[in-house]
């Protein structure tokens, strides 16, 4: 056959689909490939064919879509299984044709088994609720196209294996799932049924989502740097290890970034010569608020590192902060001799030191202090 | 290791109530769903509805709406199951049992607590 | 609602031999099918669900198959502890119904 603009398996398009329901396929060439829509291509005498490859199988071979009650049609760019079927799992072809034109694209169609509360190999959407916030909705997903405005389906919410009715805080409002005041027991996940008539048929159409209930932005507040903090203070002498941690607390803000960098001198640390290693771990509460803790860590410290500014700097949608960590150099203790007595005696002066020790364990960070005398 | 404790035995009037509780101990912090079933002597098992008690949400079974009502106090992990309007058929073992999430198909009736004999007699 | 018919009402079984439990539901339930145990004066007991998957700490002897709407419980060689009545349960469609109980008695 003539050449045909081939854009391979389009894997981004993972379609899953659940087993004995409706499910509508657009084909991928008009949505992420092609400049035009169908419309333009069918009225320029372009053809759309479907073609599918069986799971496990190398042959390609044309859809039949002559089967009883037409389970499997095509209308425009759609292509409609009425119900799916176990074995409908595949690779699917859609290609855009005429005698001098040919475009096509594959794309990967699973129908997947669910149980009786909905538990599947489903990937789930997640839907963020903030906490404590005040009404919010979240919509039973993807069900558009499947019946025209004049059927009314009935709509029944789940969590988990249990039917949404004499909620505390969660009422079923049709299509939508209203949350009156948002508490960490709504996190789970949600099904959707909706079930509508066609032709004599009864379809079912099923959609879960993961509810996830994330600080408010009521409650945001711009970066909090807890260590370095005033209290502490880094005392080493050359050759030691010097390891100061930076600590850093984020609210939860949808779509934020949060950062959190180092400077030594008012430089990256990439950017200067010294041998410098920093280690970044991160740890989110329940409501998805953020602790960052970066640890800079010199291995050998030098007199001129001691003298350095070390600068923890954070940055959120709401706000940037930087903190100075108080180092320096720890003094020798001076050596006095005593005369008199029986001889002579060594006596140390007590000078208090600060030793700091970082432990990580559980998301929760420690500074321990400990007076060497 | 979660275990399901209930209240004593009773004996009650034809017409009167009698209200069943069902302790929890050791309960994660997922929610869950508590069930109560009955057993008359010798029968098999009926169940007769649920409440998840961190949530509120309940159901009955049909033949008991109107007589039963399933509450539940989140503060003491503790289920409760009041049946009214007794009458001589309702001499039964009455049992809780609950899965360990909402979500475990098959596993709503995972954990069973000891039962409670409610005998109704004149 | 769907009714669980259990069959037979007793079982006779010698220690040490197979015995073989029906359960059937009055319309289709997928594998949502729960088997349990009940010995006098103690409280049902989950064997199975998912018509075939053992609970945690069922020994191996105990095995459940089926799909639909006709289901089998087995018990591979009986040892004398498991002298009880079995009762199977479906959950695909609410309300959650159990069937009547088979009771199975030493020959």
């Known amino acids: 056959s003539e050449r045909c603009d081939d854009w391979g398996l389009d894997t981004m398009r993972q379609i899953q689909v659940f087993e004995d329901e409706p499910a509508r396929i657009k084909c991928p060439l008009f949505e992420h490939f092609l400049k035009f829509n169908y419309s333009t291509a069918h009225s320029a005498g372009l053809t759309l064919i479907w073609y599918w490859t069986r799971q496990d199988r190398d042959l390609e071979e044309p859809i039949n879509f002559r089967l009883p009650e037409n389970r499997i049609s095509k209308e425009k760019d759609v292509l409609w299984f009425r119900p799916t079927l176990l074995n409908d799992t595949g690779n699917y072809t859609c290609m855009l044709r005429n005698t001098t034109y040919c475009s096509k694209v594959a794309f990967p169609l699973e129908v997947v088994q669910k149980d009786s509360c909905f538990n599947s190999p489903m990937k789930l959407p997640v839907h963020k609720l903030y906490i404590e916030y005040g009404i919010q909705r979240i919509t039973c997903p993807n069900v558009d196209g499947y019946f025209p405005s004049s059927v009314k389906p009935t709509i029944t919410w789940y969590m988990g294996c249990y039917k949404i009715q004499n909620f505390n805080n969660v009422i079923p409002e049709g299509m939508n799932l209203s949350f009156l005041i948002a508490l960490i027991s709504n996190n789970g996940n949600y099904t959707c049924v909706v079930t509508y008539p066609e032709n004599g048929r009864t379809f079912h159409l099923t959609r879960t989502l993961t509810v996830k209930v994330v600080g408010s932005p009521k409650n945001a507040v711009p970066p909090v740097i807890h260590s370095p903090n005033d209290h502490v203070v880094y005392e080493k002498e050359p050759g030691e290890e010097l390891l100061i941690p930076c600590t850093v607390y984020f609210s939860f803000l949808m779509d934020s970034r949060n950062e959190v960098w180092w400077t030594i001198d008012g430089k990256k640390p990439d950017d200067i010569t010294i041998d410098v290693t920093i280690n970044e771990s991160i740890s989110h509460s329940r409501t998805e608020d953020e602790t960052r803790t970066q640890i800079l860590s010199i291995k050998k410290v030098t007199s001129e590192d001691l003298k350095r500014s070390y600068v923890c700097h954070a940055r959120s949608a709401k706000g940037e902060v930087a903190k100075a960590a108080k180092v320096k150099q720890k003094v020798p203790a001076p050596r006095y001799t005593v005369e008199g007595g029986g001889g002579t005696g060594g006596l140390n002066d007590i000078f208090e030191a600060q030793k700091i020790e970082w432990h990580e364990g559980g998301g929760h960070h420690h500074h321990h202090h400990h007076h060497h005398h | 290791q979660v275990q399901l404790v209930q209240s004593g035995a009773e004996v009650k009037k034809p017409g009167s109530s009698v209200k069943v509780s069902c302790k929890a101990s050791?309960?994660?912090?997922?929610?869950?769903?508590i069930q109560w079933v009955r057993q008359a002597p010798g029968q098999g098992l009926e169940w007769m509805g649920y409440i998840i008690p961190s949530l509120g949400g309940y159901d009955y079974a049909q033949k008991f709406q109107g007589r039963v009502t399933i509450t539940a106090d989140e503060s003491t992990s503790t289920a409760y199951m009041e049946l009214s309007s007794l009458r001589s058929e309702d001499t039964a073992v009455y049992y809780c049992a609950r899965g360990q999430t909402l979500y475990e198909s098959g596993r709503q009736f995972d954990i069973w607590g000891q039962g409670t004999l409610v005998t109704v007699s004149s | 609602e769907i009714v669980m018919t259990q069959s037979p009402a007793t079982l006779s079984v010698s220690p040490g031999e197979r015995a073989t439990l029906s359960c059937r539901a009055s319309q289709s339930v997928s594998s949502n099918l729960a088997w349990y145990q009940q010995k006098p004066g103690q409280a049902p007991r989950l064997l199975i669900y998912?018509?075939?998957t053992r609970a945690t700490g069922i020994p191996a002897r105990f095995s459940g198959s089926g799909s639909g709407t006709e289901f089998t419980l087995t018990i591979s060689s009986l040892q004398s502890e498991d002298f009880a009545v079995y009762y199977c349960q479906q959950y695909n469609n609410w309300p959650w119904t159990f069937g009547q109980g088979t009771k199975v008695e030493i020959k």
């Open positions: 050791g309960s994660p912090a997922e929610p869950y769903a």
């Open positions: 998912g018509a075939s």
